[in-house]
Amino acid sequence: APVPPGEDSKDVAAPHRQPLTSSERIDKQIRYILDGISALRKETCNKSNMCESSKEALAENNLNLPKMAEKDGCFQSGFNEETCLVKIITGLLEFEVYLEYLQNRFESSEEQARAVQMSTKVLIQFLQKKAKNLDAITTPDPTTNASLLTKLQAQNQWLQDMTTHLILRSFKEFLQSSLRALRQM
């Protein structure tokens, strides 16, 4: 147990830490997810040559992965905290179906894929507490998600590998942009 302030603490292994602020918790959560994505990308790149492939555009046409744009208010020019927060939450909710797709795509990193999915849910909950205008957030339609998932799972092996690679890359980029924006808030 931490030693009360003013008492001798030389025998205590871990110093008394202040609880994390909401911003620190969000920052830490995003970095944790990014670590998970790195591990998944490593398996994907080891298994196929997708990471060096120049044929990404072929598969990207099939996907409608969330991306940050100027109008979302997350970039330094035209930064708008509330608009940006809505975009981040909406984007993460849109990524959920793609994270569902990833669940059966890994052999040695199956638990890591599940951890990324669950940690993203936790991140969404953290961010919702920060947002003032939840009414501006449109959640994905389950019927649309279901047909998208069916379509992705029906692709040939090469396209499925490419889709996996593109989801991980896009999710990483989206989280990195989110992290930069959230540090300005």
Epitope: E100, Y101, Q128, L134, D135, I137, P142, N145
Partner: nanobody
Framework: QVQLVESGGGLVQAGGSLRLSCAAS????????VGWFRQPPGKVREFVGR???????NYADSVKGRFTISRDNNNNTVYLQMNRLKPEDTAVYYC????????????WGQGTQVTVSS
């Protein structure tokens, strides 16, 4: 699979209110999304609103500001509070649950009749 049972329908005057319930039984009820739909007489089923796992709600334009979806996780129940009802809200109301992000609405209730008289 989860069984969904709607209740709370009935006959109400225009301008009145009703609260529909959607109770789930079967297994632990923690769906990705619960949606409310309605089918007016002689028409196709239409979307009313939905609430996702994190509590975010979306509504059809025709009910925005009048209808509110809420949930009680302890009782495995989702509610549809309908205020300022209009005759055109007359329909059979259904709730549906999507168990996962990619599953679509994989459980449906049997529906409850709402009639709004002028």
């Amino acid at each position: 699979q989860v069984q969904l049972v709607e209740s709370g329908g009935g006959l109400v005057q225009a301008g009145g209110s009703l609260r529909l319930s959607c109770a789930a039984s079967g297994r632990t009820f923690s769906p990705y999304t619960v949606g409310w739909f309605r089918q007016p007489p002689g028409k196709v089923r239409e979307f009313v609103g939905r609430i996702n796992w994190s509590g975010i709600r979306n509504y059809a334009d025709s009910v925005k500001g009048r209808f509110t979806i809420s949930r009680d996780n302890n009782n495995n129940t989702v509610y549809l509070q309908m205020n300022r009802l209009k005759p055109e809200d007359t329909a059979v109301y259904y709730c549906a649950a999507a168990s996962q992000s990619g599953s679509g609405y994989d459980s449906w209730g049997q529906g409850t009749q709402v009639t709004v008289s002028s």
